[in-house]
């Protein structure tokens, strides 16, 4: 390697720097299809951006390989737990790879919200953040699920949101 | 951009690169003021730093724009759930701005902490945890509110802080 | 500082910068040892990994001083909460430093799970994460506790788990 | 400056009912809760129970539960207390209380100056 | 019900001497470095006076020469030097479960 050639790579470096990946999207009206599939997000409005990542039908899509921490949260909420409903709620993080024709599951939460009803109140919130540090190649996406997504309470883009960066 | 300038460059994002903002603030016995406003923390003693962001009155004020991990964890906790405490317990981290008068809301958590006593036991604990990634301006704040913070356990610094890094 | 001597330390940064440290470790059937001791963690199947960090003992062992985030999250369950097992849960992540012969602790929380199981079902999950910013010191090691470790559900290596990137 | 003030006292036969009421003023009525204690003639306190005038939530003591009924008026920043189905063992001064909170744990801070309630036929 | 039992039930003290009460719990009241006790001051034909809350807090306007101590089941209130103006019955309060409960009472009189 050359000093041109370190050279130029610095400066590309720099530049990539400049762009280091990164994504924030947040919960919205849309978001719960009801369909089975993941979690849909707001990429623009608000507090929302895509920086280095893209985004289709509920996926961050990766453009550059390497480490990214990964992250999401989800409110939940509801007044008791309706017959038919799961008492218990899983958030996860799932990988999909255009190697394997399933979705991976990287970080997962389950929880059992309803208990947190009181003998006074039968509404009770919670809240579940997942977060970790995955290995992701170019192209590879990840999405959101919640089972079941009908206790997923969406109000302004704060308390249900998904996002990534690279380390 | 000459390559004099773009070594200019290079050293100065090297020299900055050093210091890239973060900050990890603690909980304290003067956290919780009782007047409405926001937490305080402790910024030196400890586990608590500050390094390329600055502090006042309980916010993390920003020096260098760019987009930022910030987070918060706050310990909730209580014998049972006293008639006029809260049964919901609000987490939020806010942004102030000069741009605009009111707080914005950034990322914010909801909860129902006292369903979990049980028939054995009235003592319940809880953990209330957010993070996400927000782009900040320079001189841009950012605050801690807990609705209601008379649930906000202290002790040591560690069970509630809040801090954040640049990304 | 001549321009050769900053030629060399931002070639030498570039390489440093390729491996910013990280790691994510995944719980495992070997994780609880029931001995008192740290809880253990798979450092190189599936999800996890370790780069510019190095493992010992349940222990992430820092190997270039910095600020790091660090974080862990670890999936609760039970079927009531039988006599004997503590009502409330201590997740942490704690310290150790060769300078110091105790244990620090770092980022803690306190939770009461049990009081999820509602009165239709005795089964009852919960999860609590943990993440925040601290200063560590090469061979310095951080570990993971749980009070009561019994408590700790494994499966995949999705649903507990114990990472750190350096910020 | 906090004050609760109470209605007179009162005189009721056996199996009926009293209701005492109690002012505040002085402080945001509905921040604060107002429980209700009594004290038999030369004994000690008796916790009944408490309202949240906020949203009218109520606390009860097991042993008074169905025969006390606790209300909160906030146009009137007023506390009711009524005691039904009455006899002679709840004669009685019964007092209101604000109650205030060190996190959650909660301590009567203002009181009322007394209601006696005498039950005789 | 948690059951509050005061010692003495009476007290005579000499002016400028120390007052000390006792109440004992029938379990701990504490919670994470609080303990749930409270101790009220009542005059004949007045209503109770809050002196102390969580155990060892002086409420607003209330002479220095009131402290209350103790954690787990074992509290104390004490007077450093009575006056003739703390001739009174005290109270021990818990409100760590409902019902809340208080003491019998401790009545303090002058020697």
């Known amino acids: 390697d050359g000093p041109a050639g370190s050279w130029e790579q610095l400066i590309q470096e720099r530049r990539s720097h400049e762009v280091n990946p990164a994504a924030h999207l947040t919960g919205a009206n849309s978001s719960l299809t009801g369909s089975g599939g993941p979690l849909l997000w707001e990429t623009q409005l608000g507090l929302a951006f895509l920086r280095g990542l893209s985004y289709h039908d509920g996926a961050l899509v990766v453009t550059k390989a390497g480490y990214y921490y990964i992250y999401s949260k989800v409110q939940l909420g509801g007044v008791g737990c309706p017959l038919g409903l799961a008492s218990t709620i899983t958030h996860g993080l799932y990988k999909r790879t255009p190697r394997y024709p399933e979705e991976l599951e990287l970080l997962v939460s389950q929880q059992s919200p309803c208990g947190r009803a009181t003998s006074s109140s039968r509404v009770w919130w919670d809240s579940s953040f997942l977060g970790g540090v995955v290995h992701l190649e170019a192209g590879e996406e990840v999405v959101v699920r919640v089972l079941d997504e009908r206790l997923v309470r969406l109000r302004d883009g704060t308390r249900s949101y998904f996002g990534a960066f690279m380390v | 951009d000459g390559p004099a300038g773009s070594w200019e460059q290079l050293i100065q994002e090297r020299r900055s690169h050093e210091v890239n903002p973060a900050a990890h603030l603690t909980g304290a016995n003067s956290s919780l003021t009782g007047s409405g406003g926001p937490l305080l923390w402790e910024t030196q003693l400890g586990l608590a730093f500050l390094r390329g962001l600055s502090y006042h009155d309980g916010a993390l004020v920003v020096t260098k724009a760019g987009y930022y991990y910030i987070y918060s964890k706050v310990q909730l906790g209580g014998v049972g759930c006293p008639l006029g405490l809260a049964s919901t317990i609000t987490h939020g981290l806010y942004k102030r701005t000069p741009r605009y008068p009111e707080e914005l809301e950034l990322l914010v958590s909801q909860q129902s902490p006292c369903g979990r006593a049980t028939s054995s036991s009235r003592v319940w604990w809880d953990s209330s945890f957010l993070g996400g990634v927000v782009h900040l301006e320079a001189g841009e704040e950012v605050v801690v509110r807990v609705l209601d913070e008379r649930l906000v356990r202290l002790r040591d610094g560690t069970r509630s802080y809040f801090g954040a890094f640049m990304v | 500082d001549g321009p050769a001597g900053s030629w060399e330390q931002l070639i030498q940064e570039r390489r440093s910068h390729e491996v910013n440290p990280a790691a994510h470790l995944t719980g495992a059937n070997s994780s609880l040892t029931g001995s008192g001791g740290p809880l253990l963690w798979e450092t190189q199947l599936g999800l996890a990994f370790l780069r510019g960090l190095s493992y010992h003992d349940g222990a992430l062992v820092v190997t270039k001083a910095g600020y790091y985030y660090i974080y862990s999250k670890v999936q609760l369950g039970g079927v009531g909460c039988p006599l004997g097992l503590a009502s409330t849960i201590t997740h942490g992540l704690y310290k150790r430093t060769p300078r110091y012969p105790e244990e620090l602790e770092l980022l803690v929380s306190q939770q009461s799970p049990c009081g999820r199981a509602t009165s239709s079902s005795r089964v009852w999950w919960d999860s609590s994460f943990l993440g925040g910013v601290v200063h560590l010191e090469a061979g310095e090691e951080v570990v993971v506790r749980v009070l009561d470790e019994r408590l700790v559900r494994l499966r995949d290596g999705t649903r507990s788990y114990f990472g750190a990137f350096m910020v | 400056q906090v004050q609760l003030v109470q209605s007179g006292a009162e005189v009721k036969k056996p199996g009926a009912s009293v209701k005492v009421s109690c002012k505040a003023s002085?402080?945001?009525?509905?921040?604060?809760?107002v429980h209700w204690v009594r004290q038999a003639p030369g004994q000690g306190l008796e916790w009944i129970g408490a309202?949240?005038?906020?949203?009218?939530?109520?606390s009860y003591n097991q042993k008074f539960k169905g025969r006390a009924t606790l209300t909160a008026d906030k146009s009137t920043s007023t506390v009711y207390m009524e005691l039904s189905s009455l006899r002679s063992e709840d004669t009685a001064v019964y007092y209101c209380?604000?109650?205030?909170?060190?996190?959650?744990?909660?301590?009567?801070?203002?009181w009322g100056q007394g209601t006696l309630v005498t039950v005789s036929s | 019900d948690i059951v509050l039992t005061q010692s003495p039930d009476s007290l005579a003290v000499s002016l400028g001497e120390r007052a000390t009460i006792n109440c004992k719990a029938s379990?701990?009241?504490?919670?994470?470095?609080?303990?749930?006790m409270n101790w009220y001051q009542q005059k004949p034909g007045q209503p109770p006076k809050l002196l102390i809350y969580?155990?060892?807090n002086l409420e607003s306007g209330i002479p220095d020469r009131f402290s209350g101590s103790g954690s787990g089941t074992d509290f104390t209130l004490t007077i450093s030097s009575l006056q003739a103006e703390d001739v009174a019955v005290y109270y021990c309060?818990?409100?760590?479960?409902?019902?809340?409960?208080f003491g019998q009472g401790t009545k303090v009189e002058i020697k």
């Open positions: 379990q701990s009241v504490d919670f994470d470095g609080d303990s749930y």
């Open positions: 969580t155990a060892s």
């Open positions: 309060q818990q409100s760590y479960e409902d019902p809340f409960t």
């Open positions: 002085g402080y945001t009525f509905t921040s604060y809760n």
């Open positions: 309202v949240y005038p906020g949203n009218g939530d109520t």
């Open positions: 209380a604000r109650g205030s909170y060190y996190y959650t744990s909660s301590y009567f801070d203002h």
